[in-house]
Protein backbone atom coordinates (compact mmCIF):
# COMPACT_ATOMS: atom_id res chain seq x y z
CA UNK A 1 0.00 0.00 0.00
CA UNK A 2 2.99 2.27 -0.44
CA UNK A 3 4.01 4.66 -3.16
CA UNK A 4 7.47 4.58 -4.68
CA UNK A 5 9.15 6.27 -1.74
CA UNK A 6 8.12 3.36 0.44
CA UNK A 7 8.83 3.02 4.11
CA UNK A 8 10.92 6.16 4.54
CA UNK A 9 8.03 8.35 3.43
CA UNK A 10 5.34 6.80 5.59
CA UNK A 11 7.50 6.85 8.69
CA UNK A 12 9.00 10.30 8.31
CA UNK A 13 6.93 11.77 11.15
CA UNK A 14 7.78 9.14 13.76
CA UNK A 15 10.57 11.22 15.24
CA UNK A 16 8.13 13.98 16.05
CA UNK A 17 5.28 11.97 17.47
CA UNK A 18 4.41 12.70 21.07
CA UNK A 19 3.15 10.11 23.52
CA UNK A 20 -0.10 11.31 25.01
CA UNK A 21 0.11 11.01 28.77
CA UNK A 22 2.80 9.20 30.67
CA UNK A 23 0.73 6.20 31.68
CA UNK A 24 0.05 3.32 29.30
CA UNK A 25 -3.45 2.76 27.97
CA UNK A 26 -3.12 -0.95 28.76
CA UNK A 27 -0.54 -3.46 29.92
CA UNK A 28 -0.37 -7.19 29.90
CA UNK A 29 2.00 -10.12 30.14
CA UNK A 30 2.60 -12.21 27.06
CA UNK A 31 5.17 -14.58 25.70
CA UNK A 32 6.91 -13.47 22.54
CA UNK A 33 7.65 -15.88 19.72
CA UNK A 34 8.76 -15.61 16.13
CA UNK A 35 6.64 -16.22 13.07
CA UNK A 36 8.18 -19.71 13.00
CA UNK A 37 7.22 -20.34 16.64
CA UNK A 38 10.66 -20.01 18.18
CA UNK A 39 10.55 -18.47 21.64
CA UNK A 40 12.24 -15.25 22.71
CA UNK A 41 14.00 -15.99 25.99
CA UNK A 42 15.98 -13.90 28.43
CA UNK A 43 18.91 -15.14 30.49
CA UNK A 44 20.92 -13.42 33.20
CA UNK A 45 24.61 -13.87 32.41
CA UNK A 46 27.43 -12.05 34.22
CA UNK A 47 25.05 -9.53 35.73
CA UNK A 48 23.53 -8.60 32.37
CA UNK A 49 20.66 -10.05 30.41
CA UNK A 50 21.08 -11.84 27.11
CA UNK A 51 18.25 -12.30 24.62
CA UNK A 52 17.93 -15.57 22.71
CA UNK A 53 15.71 -16.93 19.97
CA UNK A 54 15.36 -20.66 20.42
CA UNK A 55 13.20 -23.74 20.22
CA UNK A 56 11.88 -24.70 23.62
CA UNK A 57 11.59 -28.27 24.79
CA UNK A 58 8.06 -29.61 24.96
CA UNK A 59 7.19 -28.70 28.56
CA UNK A 60 9.61 -25.82 28.97
CA UNK A 61 7.95 -22.65 30.27
CA UNK A 62 7.92 -19.61 28.00
CA UNK A 63 9.38 -16.35 29.28
CA UNK A 64 6.84 -13.57 29.70
CA UNK A 65 7.24 -9.94 28.75
CA UNK A 66 5.26 -7.03 30.13
CA UNK A 67 3.96 -5.08 27.15
CA UNK A 68 2.94 -1.52 27.94
CA UNK A 69 0.90 0.15 25.22
CA UNK A 70 1.00 3.91 24.78
CA UNK A 71 -0.97 6.11 22.44
CA UNK A 72 1.07 8.45 20.33
CA UNK A 73 -0.38 11.53 18.68
CA UNK A 74 0.61 12.79 15.24
CA UNK A 75 -0.45 16.38 14.55
CA UNK A 76 -1.86 16.74 11.03
CA UNK A 77 0.93 19.08 9.96
CA UNK A 78 3.42 16.24 10.59
CA UNK A 79 1.38 13.27 9.42
CA UNK A 80 1.51 14.36 5.79
CA UNK A 81 -2.09 13.50 4.97
CA UNK A 82 -3.97 16.33 6.62
CA UNK A 83 -5.45 14.37 9.50
CA UNK A 84 -4.44 13.97 13.10
CA UNK A 85 -3.28 10.41 13.52
CA UNK A 86 -2.73 8.09 16.43
CA UNK A 87 -0.33 5.19 16.72
CA UNK A 88 0.25 2.51 19.27
CA UNK A 89 3.69 2.37 20.79
CA UNK A 90 4.92 -0.36 23.09
CA UNK A 91 7.65 -0.91 25.60
CA UNK A 92 8.73 -4.45 26.44
CA UNK A 93 9.97 -5.42 29.88
CA UNK A 94 10.89 -9.07 30.60
CA UNK A 95 11.83 -8.35 34.20
CA UNK A 96 11.46 -5.52 36.67
CA UNK A 97 13.33 -2.34 35.74
CA UNK A 98 14.71 -3.79 32.48
CA UNK A 99 13.42 -2.80 29.05
CA UNK A 100 14.25 -3.72 25.50
CA UNK A 101 16.23 -0.95 23.85
CA UNK A 102 17.13 -0.25 20.27
CA UNK A 103 20.85 0.31 19.84
CA UNK A 104 20.82 1.89 16.41
CA UNK A 105 24.58 2.27 16.16
CA UNK A 106 25.19 -1.44 16.73
CA UNK A 107 21.94 -2.53 14.99
CA UNK A 108 21.24 -4.54 18.11
CA UNK A 109 18.42 -5.08 20.59
CA UNK A 110 19.56 -4.91 24.19
CA UNK A 111 18.12 -5.07 27.68
CA UNK A 112 18.87 -1.98 29.71
CA UNK A 113 18.07 -1.17 33.29
CA UNK A 114 16.52 2.26 33.53
CA UNK A 115 14.03 4.41 35.36
CA UNK A 116 10.96 6.14 34.03
CA UNK A 117 10.49 8.23 32.01
CA UNK A 118 11.95 5.75 29.56
CA UNK A 119 14.16 6.97 26.74
CA UNK A 120 12.87 6.98 23.17
CA UNK A 121 15.05 3.97 22.40
CA UNK A 122 12.70 1.84 24.54
CA UNK A 123 9.62 2.69 22.47
CA UNK A 124 8.53 0.75 19.41
CA UNK A 125 5.70 1.56 17.02
CA UNK A 126 3.33 -1.39 16.83
CA UNK A 127 2.35 -2.71 13.41
CA UNK A 128 0.10 -5.59 12.53
CA UNK A 129 0.94 -5.97 8.88
CA UNK A 130 0.20 -9.66 8.88
CA UNK A 131 -2.77 -11.57 10.23
CA UNK A 132 -2.34 -12.09 13.98
CA UNK A 133 1.34 -11.12 13.95
CA UNK A 134 2.92 -7.87 15.04
CA UNK A 135 6.08 -5.97 14.22
CA UNK A 136 8.02 -3.48 16.31
CA UNK A 137 9.44 -0.40 14.60
CA UNK A 138 12.03 1.77 16.35
CA UNK A 139 10.65 5.12 17.40
CA UNK A 140 14.16 6.54 17.08
CA UNK A 141 14.86 5.10 13.63
CA UNK A 142 11.89 4.91 11.26
CA UNK A 143 12.01 1.99 8.87
CA UNK A 144 14.06 -0.10 11.30
CA UNK A 145 12.35 -3.04 13.00
CA UNK A 146 13.15 -5.62 15.65
CA UNK A 147 13.97 -8.81 13.79
CA UNK A 148 15.63 -12.18 14.08
CA UNK A 149 19.18 -12.66 12.87
CA UNK A 150 21.39 -15.66 13.71
CA UNK A 151 19.20 -16.76 16.64
CA UNK A 152 19.33 -13.33 18.22
CA UNK A 153 17.21 -10.22 18.08
CA UNK A 154 18.67 -7.48 15.90
CA UNK A 155 17.58 -4.27 14.24
CA UNK A 156 16.69 -4.79 10.62
CA UNK A 157 16.29 -2.02 8.06
CA UNK A 158 13.15 -2.46 5.98
CA UNK A 159 13.61 -0.56 2.76
CA UNK A 160 10.44 -1.35 0.85
CA UNK A 161 6.82 -2.12 1.58
CA UNK A 162 7.23 -5.67 0.27
CA UNK A 163 9.75 -6.38 3.03
CA UNK A 164 7.35 -5.29 5.77
CA UNK A 165 5.97 -8.81 5.74
CA UNK A 166 9.23 -10.71 5.78
CA UNK A 167 8.99 -13.41 8.39
CA UNK A 168 12.04 -12.30 10.36
CA UNK A 169 10.32 -9.13 11.63
CA UNK A 170 7.00 -10.82 12.46
CA UNK A 171 6.23 -11.86 16.03
CA UNK A 172 3.38 -13.58 17.81
CA UNK A 173 2.08 -12.58 21.23
CA UNK A 174 0.50 -15.21 23.44
CA UNK A 175 -0.90 -14.89 26.93
CA UNK A 176 -0.63 -18.64 27.50
Amino acid sequence: AFGISGVQKYTRALHDSSITGISPITEYLASLSTYNDQSITFALEDESYEIYVEDLKKDEKKDKVLLSYYESQHPSNESGDGVDGKMLMVTLSPTKDFWLHANNKEHSVELHKCEKPLPDQAFFVLHNMHSNCVSFECKTDPGVFIGVKDNHLALIKVDSSENLCTENILFKLSET
Epitope: A1, F2, G3, K9, Y10, I25, T26, Y28, Y69, H74, S79, G80, D81, G82, V83, G85, K86, M87, L88, V125, L126, H127, N128, M129, H130, S131, N132, V134, E137, S161, E162, L164, C165, E175
Partner: antibody
Framework: QVQLQESGPGLVKPSETLSLTCTVS????????VHWIRQPPGKGLEWIGV???????SYNSALMSRVTISEDISKSQVSLKLSSVTAADTAVYYC???????????????WGQGTLVTVSS | DIQMTQSPSSVSASVGDRVTITCLAS??????LAWYQQKPGKSPKLLIY???RLADGVPSRFSGSGSGTDFTLTISSLQPEDFATYYC?????????FGQGTKVEIK
Protein backbone atom coordinates in the same frame (compact mmCIF):
# COMPACT_ATOMS: atom_id res chain seq x y z
CA GLN B 1 -11.52 15.52 6.13
CA VAL B 2 -11.59 11.72 6.19
CA GLN B 3 -14.08 10.19 3.77
CA LEU B 4 -14.84 6.70 2.48
CA GLN B 5 -17.36 6.10 -0.28
CA GLU B 6 -18.59 2.69 -1.44
CA SER B 7 -19.81 2.26 -5.00
CA GLY B 8 -20.95 -0.56 -7.23
CA PRO B 9 -24.05 -2.23 -8.65
CA GLY B 10 -26.98 -2.54 -6.29
CA LEU B 11 -28.25 -5.73 -7.92
CA VAL B 12 -26.27 -8.88 -8.65
CA LYS B 13 -27.56 -12.16 -10.05
CA PRO B 14 -27.05 -15.43 -8.15
CA SER B 15 -23.78 -17.24 -9.01
CA GLU B 16 -22.24 -14.01 -10.34
CA THR B 17 -19.51 -11.89 -8.80
CA LEU B 18 -20.26 -8.89 -6.59
CA SER B 19 -17.79 -6.04 -7.21
CA LEU B 20 -17.55 -2.95 -5.01
CA THR B 21 -15.09 -0.09 -4.77
CA CYS B 22 -14.23 2.03 -1.74
CA THR B 23 -12.81 5.42 -2.71
CA VAL B 24 -11.00 7.14 0.15
CA SER B 25 -9.85 10.70 0.73
CA UNK B 26 -8.32 12.68 3.56
CA UNK B 27 -5.87 9.95 4.55
CA UNK B 28 -3.21 7.72 3.11
CA UNK B 29 -3.60 4.00 2.40
CA UNK B 30 0.08 3.67 3.30
CA UNK B 31 -0.74 4.50 6.92
CA UNK B 32 -4.20 3.06 7.57
CA UNK B 33 -5.83 -0.29 6.98
CA VAL B 34 -9.19 -0.36 5.20
CA HIS B 35 -11.75 -3.02 6.12
CA TRP B 36 -14.86 -4.39 4.46
CA ILE B 37 -17.83 -5.21 6.68
CA ARG B 38 -21.33 -6.28 5.71
CA GLN B 39 -24.73 -6.25 7.38
CA PRO B 40 -27.68 -8.29 6.08
CA PRO B 41 -31.02 -6.45 6.40
CA GLY B 42 -32.14 -6.41 10.04
CA LYS B 43 -29.10 -8.37 11.21
CA GLY B 44 -25.70 -7.79 12.77
CA LEU B 45 -22.27 -6.88 11.43
CA GLU B 46 -19.88 -9.34 9.79
CA TRP B 47 -16.23 -8.56 9.12
CA ILE B 48 -15.15 -9.59 5.61
CA GLY B 49 -11.48 -8.64 5.42
CA VAL B 50 -8.84 -5.95 5.52
CA UNK B 51 -6.25 -4.40 3.29
CA UNK B 52 -3.55 -3.47 5.77
CA UNK B 53 -1.28 -0.43 5.59
CA UNK B 54 1.62 -2.64 4.50
CA UNK B 55 -0.37 -3.99 1.58
CA UNK B 56 -1.08 -7.40 3.10
CA UNK B 57 -4.62 -8.72 3.13
CA SER B 58 -6.47 -10.79 5.73
CA TYR B 59 -9.83 -12.43 5.09
CA ASN B 60 -12.59 -13.92 7.19
CA SER B 61 -12.03 -17.66 6.80
CA ALA B 62 -15.78 -18.17 6.38
CA LEU B 63 -15.62 -16.23 3.11
CA MET B 64 -12.01 -16.72 2.09
CA SER B 65 -12.67 -19.06 -0.84
CA ARG B 66 -14.92 -16.46 -2.48
CA VAL B 67 -13.49 -13.07 -1.54
CA THR B 68 -10.72 -10.92 -3.03
CA ILE B 69 -9.62 -7.52 -1.76
CA SER B 70 -7.24 -5.37 -3.80
CA GLU B 71 -6.12 -1.78 -4.10
CA ASP B 72 -5.35 0.89 -6.66
CA ILE B 73 -3.12 3.37 -4.86
CA SER B 74 -3.12 5.87 -7.72
CA LYS B 75 -6.90 6.17 -7.43
CA SER B 76 -7.02 5.83 -3.61
CA GLN B 77 -9.36 2.89 -4.03
CA VAL B 78 -9.85 -0.44 -2.30
CA SER B 79 -11.90 -3.05 -4.13
CA LEU B 80 -13.96 -6.01 -2.94
CA LYS B 81 -14.96 -8.96 -5.09
CA LEU B 82 -17.21 -11.74 -3.83
CA SER B 83 -17.79 -14.62 -6.22
CA SER B 84 -20.59 -17.18 -6.56
CA VAL B 85 -23.06 -15.02 -4.66
CA THR B 86 -26.39 -16.26 -3.30
CA ALA B 87 -29.35 -14.54 -1.66
CA ALA B 88 -27.51 -14.91 1.67
CA ASP B 89 -24.98 -12.33 0.43
CA THR B 90 -27.68 -9.64 0.24
CA ALA B 91 -26.46 -6.97 2.65
CA VAL B 92 -25.33 -3.42 3.14
CA TYR B 93 -21.58 -3.43 2.46
CA TYR B 94 -19.38 -0.94 4.31
CA CYS B 95 -15.74 0.01 4.06
CA UNK B 96 -14.08 1.45 7.16
CA UNK B 97 -10.71 2.85 8.18
CA UNK B 98 -8.57 1.84 11.14
CA UNK B 99 -8.40 4.15 14.14
CA UNK B 100 -4.62 3.70 14.52
CA UNK B 101 -1.83 4.05 12.02
CA UNK B 102 -0.42 0.65 11.05
CA UNK B 103 -2.66 -1.50 13.24
CA UNK B 104 -6.27 -2.54 13.74
CA UNK B 105 -6.22 -2.81 17.53
CA UNK B 106 -8.13 0.46 17.97
CA UNK B 107 -11.19 -0.46 15.94
CA UNK B 108 -12.64 1.35 12.94
CA UNK B 109 -12.84 5.11 13.35
CA UNK B 110 -14.34 6.14 10.03
CA TRP B 111 -16.98 4.36 7.95
CA GLY B 112 -18.48 4.82 4.53
CA GLN B 113 -22.22 5.34 4.28
CA GLY B 114 -22.68 1.76 3.02
CA THR B 115 -24.17 0.41 -0.18
CA LEU B 116 -27.00 -2.09 -0.36
CA VAL B 117 -26.34 -5.04 -2.64
CA THR B 118 -29.28 -7.30 -3.44
CA VAL B 119 -28.68 -10.75 -4.89
CA SER B 120 -31.65 -11.70 -7.01
CA SER B 121 -32.42 -13.02 -10.46
CA ASP C 1 -12.67 -17.79 15.79
CA ILE C 2 -13.41 -15.71 18.87
CA GLN C 3 -17.11 -15.52 19.71
CA MET C 4 -18.49 -12.30 21.17
CA THR C 5 -21.68 -12.59 23.22
CA GLN C 6 -23.59 -9.43 24.05
CA SER C 7 -26.29 -9.09 26.66
CA PRO C 8 -29.02 -8.13 26.85
CA SER C 9 -30.15 -8.35 23.22
CA SER C 10 -32.51 -5.43 23.90
CA VAL C 11 -33.22 -3.05 26.74
CA SER C 12 -36.07 -0.62 27.31
CA ALA C 13 -35.07 2.51 29.18
CA SER C 14 -36.11 6.09 29.81
CA VAL C 15 -34.22 9.32 29.30
CA GLY C 16 -31.92 9.85 32.29
CA ASP C 17 -31.56 6.11 33.02
CA ARG C 18 -28.23 4.41 33.49
CA VAL C 19 -27.79 1.66 30.89
CA THR C 20 -25.22 -1.13 31.03
CA ILE C 21 -24.41 -3.51 28.17
CA THR C 22 -22.01 -6.41 28.60
CA CYS C 23 -19.86 -8.27 26.11
CA LEU C 24 -18.20 -11.62 26.76
CA ALA C 25 -15.33 -12.93 24.63
CA SER C 26 -14.88 -16.68 24.21
CA UNK C 27 -11.15 -16.26 24.86
CA UNK C 28 -8.96 -13.53 26.24
CA UNK C 29 -8.55 -10.49 24.00
CA UNK C 30 -6.56 -8.21 26.29
CA UNK C 31 -7.93 -4.69 25.94
CA UNK C 32 -8.62 -4.95 22.23
CA LEU C 33 -12.34 -4.29 22.25
CA ALA C 34 -14.35 -1.56 20.54
CA TRP C 35 -17.95 -0.42 20.98
CA TYR C 36 -20.04 1.06 18.18
CA GLN C 37 -23.40 2.82 18.03
CA GLN C 38 -25.63 2.35 15.01
CA LYS C 39 -28.85 4.15 14.21
CA PRO C 40 -31.34 2.87 11.61
CA GLY C 41 -30.14 3.46 8.05
CA LYS C 42 -26.80 4.83 9.25
CA SER C 43 -23.24 3.54 9.46
CA PRO C 44 -21.82 2.36 12.80
CA LYS C 45 -20.00 5.01 14.81
CA LEU C 46 -16.97 4.25 16.99
CA LEU C 47 -17.69 5.09 20.64
CA ILE C 48 -15.00 3.31 22.65
CA TYR C 49 -11.72 1.71 21.61
CA UNK C 50 -9.08 -0.21 23.53
CA UNK C 51 -11.89 -1.18 25.96
CA UNK C 52 -11.88 2.13 27.85
CA ARG C 53 -10.82 4.95 25.52
CA LEU C 54 -13.44 7.44 24.40
CA ALA C 55 -13.34 8.11 20.65
CA ASP C 56 -13.11 11.70 19.44
CA GLY C 57 -16.32 13.69 19.82
CA VAL C 58 -18.12 11.06 21.92
CA PRO C 59 -19.94 12.47 24.99
CA SER C 60 -18.47 11.59 28.38
CA ARG C 61 -21.69 9.88 29.49
CA PHE C 62 -20.38 6.88 27.52
CA SER C 63 -17.72 4.78 29.23
CA GLY C 64 -16.13 1.39 28.75
CA SER C 65 -14.53 -1.00 31.19
CA GLY C 66 -13.09 -4.49 31.35
CA SER C 67 -10.19 -6.53 30.00
CA GLY C 68 -9.49 -10.12 29.16
CA THR C 69 -12.90 -11.65 28.46
CA ASP C 70 -15.48 -9.43 30.23
CA PHE C 71 -16.36 -5.96 29.01
CA THR C 72 -19.01 -3.36 29.76
CA LEU C 73 -20.40 -0.30 28.01
CA THR C 74 -22.18 2.15 30.31
CA ILE C 75 -24.35 5.12 29.40
CA SER C 76 -24.55 7.08 32.64
CA SER C 77 -27.61 9.15 31.78
CA LEU C 78 -29.47 8.12 28.65
CA GLN C 79 -30.27 10.94 26.23
CA PRO C 80 -32.89 10.93 23.43
CA GLU C 81 -30.17 10.62 20.77
CA ASP C 82 -28.76 7.47 22.43
CA PHE C 83 -31.62 5.21 21.37
CA ALA C 84 -29.83 2.95 18.91
CA THR C 85 -28.21 -0.46 18.53
CA TYR C 86 -24.80 -1.03 20.14
CA TYR C 87 -22.19 -3.54 19.00
CA CYS C 88 -18.97 -4.75 20.58
CA UNK C 89 -16.08 -5.99 18.44
CA UNK C 90 -12.88 -7.80 19.30
CA UNK C 91 -9.69 -6.72 17.52
CA UNK C 92 -7.25 -9.11 19.14
CA UNK C 93 -7.16 -11.53 16.22
CA UNK C 94 -8.73 -12.09 12.83
CA UNK C 95 -11.51 -12.53 11.99
CA UNK C 96 -12.48 -9.37 13.89
CA UNK C 97 -15.80 -10.59 15.22
CA PHE C 98 -18.74 -8.50 16.42
CA GLY C 99 -21.30 -9.16 19.11
CA GLN C 100 -24.86 -9.70 17.93
CA GLY C 101 -25.93 -6.22 19.05
CA THR C 102 -28.01 -4.67 21.84
CA LYS C 103 -30.98 -2.51 20.91
CA VAL C 104 -31.68 0.32 23.35
CA GLU C 105 -35.35 1.25 23.02
CA ILE C 106 -37.58 3.90 24.56
CA LYS C 107 -39.62 2.59 27.49
Amino acid sequence: QVQLQESGPGLVKPSETLSLTCTVSGFSLSKYGVHWIRQPPGKGLEWIGVLRAGGTISYNSALMSRVTISEDISKSQVSLKLSSVTAADTAVYYCARDHYYYSSFGGFASWGQGTLVTVSS
Amino acid sequence: DIQMTQSPSSVSASVGDRVTITCLASQTIGAWLAWYQQKPGKSPKLLIYAATRLADGVPSRFSGSGSGTDFTLTISSLQPEDFATYYCQQLNSTPYTFGQGTKVEIK
